[in-house]
């Protein structure tokens, strides 16, 4: 959580982001919120990113402004225009592409005052596993499979019954390259595999960690799956 | 004895939504997954996805995604399954069944017409 | 997904016959195969689980077998009501898929 506060002139107003990270190829959010002004108009949200010469997004006098917004966001950006006013700045950005990723500020001018507040922004790719049994002669093994990381992940395997077992030696992990040529697909194979047992298969990488979970037993197996992004501090 | 009691037939016009209800006695309904299944006129089973009642966790097949819900009330033991823009296909006796499908309800009727 | 081929579709049958079903899927899936018994306004009932295991209060005349792609059940002698209709099911794979059915009818 970052929280910034303006300087000089004007009164100071308090603007707070969170860190986040934007999975490649779909829409991300960069979150900001500011103290609230009871005129639309006399709101000016901008935002920048370090490193790039136009704005972002600039929305002000209740609309969008986008007359100096850099090439590399055109078409991509829009601020929640019915929550400006609530206090929300914050900003979609469509089609996340990994050089999305950096340091961006976020500044908020009101009738109150001025502040700003930067965010870290991290781009990447994640995507919930899926664990199934298969069977090919005559032994099951388990395969845990997921679609989209980047940067490359690790995976780890654990099981309830052997806790704290290493399951490097009994398992095999393959990355396969996605037809976008950034993306990986995500294949690992554990073998030796015991019923009545519940195995976990945890994909992470600086951005996201992601587990699989499969409870078999005779009568059932039982799957879930959790991702959480790493990382998501305020500002 | 182990129950499961369904709500009864519903006849819905394309493009609206159904909520059938399944009503479970005799075991703890927290320590089961529920799964529902449907069954077209004259068709095979199919399965539409399943329930944990402790946490809500779910599982869908895709082919109802988005536009199956299921959702539990620990506090009356029942499980729910709406299906929201229905149309002709989607006729068909709708089942819930308990955990590793071993008993069912008696199925709920839901014709879709207009 | 699983496919899940059952045959025949319909057999005639006599009492005290033996009957045999079978249920092919399209890839391996170990033992995790049910099956169950469905009769016309009726509650659809397990019969046996993991490929072999007669779920409780099944009559033992009921029986199953095969491993990986290739299942059976067999009901030894047929009884009156027995005649309904079949489901095989796998649930190594989400989603869980079904066999078309056997309708067993009186010959």
């Known amino acids: 959580l970052i929280i910034g506060f303006g300087i000089s002139g004007r009164h100071s107003i308090t603007v707070t982001t969170v860190a986040s990270a934007g999975n490649i190829g779909e829409d991300g959010i960069l979150s900001c919120t500011f103290e609230p002004d009871i005129k639309l108009s006399d709101i000016v949200i901008q935002w920048l990113k370090e490193g790039v010469l136009g704005l972002v997004h600039e929305f002000k006098e209740g609309k969008d402004e986008l007359s100096e917004q850099d090439e590399m966001f055109r078409g991509r950006t829009a601020v929640f225009a019915d929550q400006v006013i609530v206090g929300n700045a914050s900003l979609r950005l469509k089609n996340v592409q990994l050089t999305d990723a950096g340091t961006y500020k976020c500044y908020i001018i009101t009738s109150k005052g001025k502040g700003n507040a930067n965010l870290e922004y991290k781009t990447g790719a994640f995507s919930m596993p899926e664990v199934n049994v298969d069977y090919n002669a005559s032994s099951e093994t388990l395969r845990c499979e997921a679609p989209r990381w980047f940067p490359q992940p690790t995976v780890v395997w654990a099981s309830q019954v052997d806790q704290g077992a290493n399951f490097s030696e009994v398992s095999n992990t393959s990355f396969e390259l996605n037809s976008e040529n950034v993306t990986m697909k995500v294949v690992s194979v554990l073998y030796n595999v015991t019923i009545n047992n519940t195995y976990s298969c945890m994909i992470e990488n600086d951005i996201a960690k992601a587990t699989g979970d499969i409870k078999v037993t005779e009568s059932e197996i039982k799957r879930r799956s959790h991702l959480q992004l790493l990382n998501s501090k305020a500002s | 004895e182990v129950q499961l009691v369904q709500s009864g037939a519903e006849v819905k016009k394309p493009g609206s939504s159904v909520k059938v209800s399944c009503k479970t006695s005799?075991?703890?309904?927290?320590?089961?997954?529920m799964h529902w299944v449907r069954q077209a006129p004259g068709q095979g089973l199919e399965w539409i996805g399943e329930i944990d009642p402790s946490d809500s966790y779910i599982n869908y097949n895709q082919k109802f995604k988005g536009r199956a819900t299921l959702t539990v009330d620990k506090s009356t033991s029942t499980a729910y399954m709406e299906l929201s823009s229905l149309r002709s296909e989607d006729t068909a006796v709708y089942y819930c069944a308990r955990g590793p499908r071993d008993y069912w309800g008696q199925g709920t009727t839901v014709t879709v017409s207009s | 997904d699983i496919q899940m081929t059952q045959s025949p579709s319909s057999l005639s049958a006599s009492v005290g016959d033996r009957v045999t079903i079978t249920c092919s899927a399209s890839q391996g899936i170990s033992n995790y195969l049910n099956w169950y018994q469905q009769k016309p306004g009726k509650a659809v009932k397990l019969l046996i689980y993991?490929?072999?295991r007669l779920h409780s209060g099944v009559p033992s005349r009921f029986s199953g077998s095969g491993s990986g792609t290739d299942f059976t059940l067999t009901i030894s002698s047929l009884q009156p009501e027995d005649f309904a209709t079949y489901y095989c099911?796998?649930?190594?794979?989400?989603?869980?898929?079904f066999g078309g059915g056997t309708k067993v009818e009186i010959k």
């Open positions: 993991y490929t072999s």
């Open positions: 005799g075991y703890t309904f927290t320590s089961y997954w």
């Open positions: 099911q796998q649930y190594s794979k989400l989603p869980y898929t």
